[in-house]
Amino acid sequence: EVTLLDSRSVQGELGWIASPLEGGWEEVSIMDEKNTPIRTYQVCNVMEPSQNNWLRTDWITREGAQRVYIEIKFTLRDCNSLPGVMGTCKETFNLYYYESDNDKERFIRENQFVKIDTIAADESFTQVDIGDRIMKLNTEIRDVGPLSKKGFYLAFQDVGACIALVSVRVFYKKA
């Protein structure tokens, strides 16, 4: 495997693009069991209907790979565990990509992104000890291809879930 993006290995802030700029996805630093900061993106607007919060990564080179794999580690709150939000709370988010030769796209319209999949929390999860808390970490992998441009952007669309993206890794498999 060749890694193209690993959010856990980025030094400092990830600085991905959130839309809207305020009130949607927020970058939040948490400490792992070794007291090392993990950069996460979180959103939990479960009280208000019709949420449409987007988060876009930086440009990711494909390094000639025809097909890439996206591994997302995330936590997703069960709506039943959040008091009194059943009508508006959701338990999925959407994953998109946009191919581009331009590594500095300033603005990408929502309708330019191609949907990869709707992601839900699996029944299986990894329990991760962080201090005195247990984090239930889901892992989902999706692939996309064939790719033709020099690189691409990923986007995550929140529609009203309580979610934290803990790790995003993009890789391809060497022949």
Epitope: E22, G23, E26, V28, T40, Q42, T75, I134, K136, I163
Partner: nanobody
Framework: QVQLQESGGGLVQAGGSLRLSCAAS????????IGWFRQAPGTKREMIAA???????NYANPVKGRFTISRDDAKNMVYLQMNNLKPEDSAVYYC????????????WGPGTQVTVSS
Amino acid sequence: QVQLQESGGGLVQAGGSLRLSCAASGFASDAYAIGWFRQAPGTKREMIAAVTKAGATNYANPVKGRFTISRDDAKNMVYLQMNNLKPEDSAVYYCNAISPLWDEYDFWGPGTQVTVSS
């Protein structure tokens, strides 16, 4: 050790105002948001307002436009300004952390009683 102490409740006439305060300490710095919740007799607890670390706010429909949540991180305080109160706002009000990371509420403060008379 998480400590939550709500205050500011009381008896008020319909159309009146109250300002609730929550002294919150012991939360990890990764608490994404602080929220206000309420529970009326015979009903389930409901989340009514939240303010994130970055200061973004959101509200449940029954209180939108009437209640305002704010936070003062320097003082570890969260506030709920309640205007144009209605009898159906009568409940015990609680504050707590809201986090996508943790799936349990293992500690609640005593709450503060709000009673709105008609």
